[in-house]
C-alpha cells in the first residue's frame, strides 16, 4: 500500500492576511485565523512529518480584498509560489479581469501547473495561451505518479469575464477523455481538482471512470467528521463518499473558504491504485498555529503599498 | 539500495571536452530533480546545474554556462554532464546528486561519490 | 544571487561539547535551507533539510533551525564520528548556493 497525504485551499478569495473568525479584517490578532503565514507553518508540519504530500488549490484565489484590487493577481502568483503549491485549478474568479488578468499575473508568474480540462480556447487566443494552463498533469510523488485533472465551474461566462474566445464545455464530458488519456500513461492514482461546487464535484466522482478523489471548490462546503471546530456548519462527512456507477467509494472534499481552515485527507492506494482506505479533517488555521516569520515579513512588504492605496 | 555511481572523470586538456556518466538505481529515476555539484581541491561545495524530473527545465551555475550542458536518459536511469571548453578552473570532484520530486528547487538527499576531473596542459 | 555566509570556518571541540554553526543568508530565503555533513575524501551527506528536518537516519543530536536570512546547526554532543566539515545550502531559488563550510577539528 502507498499513502499519499493531500493538502487542499479552495475559495481563499485575496485573504493573504490574518482573518477574524468570520474571515473580515482582523482586528483582534491573538484571535486571528488564517493567512498564508499561518498556512505555510501547518503545511511544512506535514510536509516533514509525512512522506507524500500534494498541496492543492481548487481555484478562486481572485477577488475578495484589497490585496487583489491593487496587486490583480501578481500576491497569489508570488505567495502561492513562496508556499509551494504543487497545482491550482482554475475557478470563475480567475477571469475576472479578462483572460489577460490572468495570464500575465498567474499563468505566466506561476511555477506550478494551472489546470481545466473543460476550458478550451479559440481564435486568436488559442495560440496565445497555449501550454500555459493544462487539462492535466502527472506529478511525481515520491516512487509514485499521480495524475491531476482540472475542471471549471461551466457558468463561469455568466459569473466573470473570460470573453468570448474560451469555450466551457460540461465537466463530465471533458473530463472523462482526459482521464481516460491519463490510464493509458499508465497512471493509475488520479485526482479531479476544480471549481463547480458540491453538486458538480459529486457527480464527477459518481460518472467519471477512473478518478479516484475529488477536490472541489466554489460552494464553499464545509465538510467535517466529528465536533466541528469553529462556526461552520458541515455539509457531511469528510470526506463524503460517493459510491461510483462502476461501484468504487470514491471521496470527495472541500475545505470551506477564504483560507479559514487547510483540507487534509490522507489516502491509501493499493499496488494498482485503488483506494483502500481515506479520512481526514480540515485543519482550522486559528492562532495556536504561529504565522511563520519569513512569510509574514514578506507580507508586510507587500502590505506597504496596500497601506499607501488606502490613504 | 538506492545508489548513484559517476564515472567518465579524467585528465584533461583546457579547451577539450569530456563527459560525465551518473548511473542510478534503487529509487524511480524519471520522478526526480537531478543535480551536478563539484568541489575543487581544498574548497567548499559549489552548485552546478539542475535538470528536472521530465528533462523540461535546465539551470546552470554562472561559471558554466554555454559550456556545460545537462541531460538525462530516464530509460537508462542515467544523468549526463557534457562538458566543452575546460577551463583549469574546472578542475574539482564531480558529485551528482538528487533533488525533489517537483519543479522547485530542493535539497539533495542523496550523493554519489564522485569522479575526478583535472583540466591540464 | 543568494550568498551563504557560514560562521565559524573552523572550530576546535571535544568530545561530549556542544557545538553550535552559524549560516547566513544574504536575503530571505524562508526555511529552504539544508545542512550537510563531509568527511575528508568522501562525499557528503544530508543531515537536515526545511532548516530543522532530520534526513532519516541521522543521530538526534544534530538539530536545525532557523528562518528567514539566520540558521543554526547544532550538535548537542559531539561524537568521535561527528569531525568533518559542515555546509549550508540555500534551496529558496536558482542558482543554489552553499556557505563556505565549517571544519569541525579535535581539541
Known amino acids: 500500500a502507498w499513502e499519499l497525504t493531500i493538502l487542499h485551499t479552495n475559495d481563499v478569495h485575496s485573504r493573504l492576511e490574518q482573518t477574524s473568525e468570520d474571515s473580515s479584517k482582523c482586528v483582534n490578532a491573538s484571535r486571528c485565523m488564517g493567512g498564508v503565514a499561518r498556512l505555510f507553518t501547518k503545511v511544512q508540519q506535514i510536509r516533514r512529518a509525512e512522506p507524500n504530500v500534494l498541496l492543492l488549490d481548487a481555484g478562486d484565489q481572485y477577488q475578495g480584498t484589497i490585496w487583489f484590487t491593487v496587486y490583480k493577481g501578481a500576491e497569489v502568483a508570488h505567495f502561492m509560489n513562496a508556499l509551494r503549491y504543487d497545482a491550482m485549478a482554475l475557478g470563475n474568479h480567475e477571469f475576472d479581469n479578462g483572460v489577460e488578468g490572468l495570464i500575465e499575473p498567474l499563468l505566466k508568474e506561476a511555477k506550478f501547473p494551472i489546470l481545466s480540462a473543460n476550458i478550451k480556447a479559440k481564435g486568436p487566443l488559442a495560440s496565445q495561451i497555449s501550454g500555459l494552463y493544462l487539462p492535466y498533469k502527472v506529478l511525481p510523488v515520491g516512487d509514485e505518479v499521480v495524475g491531476i485533472v482540472g475542471y471549471t465551474s461551466k457558468e463561469t461566462p455568466f459569473l466573470s469575464n473570460p470573453g468570448t474566445n474560451l469555450v466551457f464545455e460540461d465537466e463530465i464530458t471533458a473530463l472523462q477523455p482526459e482521464v481516460d488519456k491519463l490510464k493509458t500513461l499508465n497512471v493509475n492514482k488520479i485526482i479531479a481538482l476544480g471549481h463547480s461546487g458540491f453538486e458538480m464535484d459529486k457527480l464527477i466522482a459518481q460518472k467519471v471512470r477512473g478518478v479516484d478523489v475529488v477536490v472541489g471548490g466554489h460552494s464553499n462546503t464545509f465538510l467535517y467528521t466529528g465536533n466541528p471546530p469553529s462556526k461552520e456548519v458541515p455539509a457531511g462527512k469528510y470526506p463524503f463518499i460517493v459510491t461510483s456507477d462502476d461501484g468504487r467509494k470514491v471521496p470527495v472534499v472541500q475545505a470551506y473558504a477564504f483560507g479559514k481552515y487547510l483540507g487534509y485527507l490522507k489516502i491509501e492506494f493499493d499496488e494498482r491504485g485503488n483506494v483502500i482506505s481515506s479520512h481526514g479533517n480540515p485543519i482550522l488555521l486559528n492562532s495556536s498555529i504561529p504565522e511563520d516569520p519569513s512569510i509574514k515579513a514578506d507580507i508586510n512588504k507587500w502590505r506597504i503599498k496596500l497601506d499607501n492605496y488606502s490613504t | 539500495q538506492v545508489q548513484l555511481v559517476e564515472s567518465g572523470g579524467g585528465v584533461v586538456q583546457p579547451g577539450r571536452s569530456l563527459r560525465l556518466s551518473c548511473a542510478a538505481s534503487g529509487f524511480t529515476f524519471s520522478n526526480y530533480g537531478m543535480h551536478w555539484v563539484r568541489q575543487a581541491p581544498g574548497k567548499g561545495l559549489e552548485w552546478v546545474a539542475v535538470i528536472w524530473y521530465d528533462g523540461g527545465n535546465k539551470y546552470y551555475a554562472d561559471s558554466v554556462k554555454g559550456r556545460f550542458t545537462i541531460s538525462r536518459d530516464n530509460s537508462k536511469n542515467t544523468l549526463f554532464l557534457q562538458m566543452n571548453s575546460l577551463r583549469a578552473e574546472d578542475t574539482a570532484v564531480y558529485y551528482c546528486?538528487?533533488?525533489?520530486?517537483?519543479?522547485?528547487?530542493?535539497?539533495?538527499?542523496?550523493w554519489g561519490q564522485g569522479t575526478m576531473v583535472t583540466v591540464s596542459s | 544571487d543568494i550568498q551563504m555566509t557560514q560562521s565559524p570556518s573552523s572550530l576546535s571541540a571535544s568530545v561530549g561539547d556542544r557545538v553550535t554553526i552559524t549560516c547566513r543568508a544574504s536575503?530571505?530565503?524562508?526555511?529552504?535551507l539544508a545542512w550537510y555533513q563531509q568527511k575528508p575524501e568522501k562525499a557528503p551527506k544530508s543531515l537536515i533539510y526545511?532548516?530543522?528536518s532530520l534526513q532519516s537516519g541521522v543521530p538526534s543530536r544534530f538539530s536545525g533551525s532557523g528562518s528567514g536570512t539566520d540558521f543554526t546547526l547544532t550538535i548537542s554532543s559531539l561524537q568521535p564520528e561527528d569531525f568533518a566539515t559542515y555546509y549550508c545550502q540555500q534551496y529558496n531559488s536558482y542558482p543554489l548556493t552553499f556557505g563556505g563550510g565549517t571544519k569541525v577539528e579535535i581539541k
Open positions: 546528486a538528487r533533488g525533489g520530486s517537483s519543479w522547485y528547487p530542493d535539497a539533495f538527499d542523496i
Open positions: 526545511a532548516a530543522s
Open positions: 536575503q530571505g530565503i524562508s526555511s529552504w
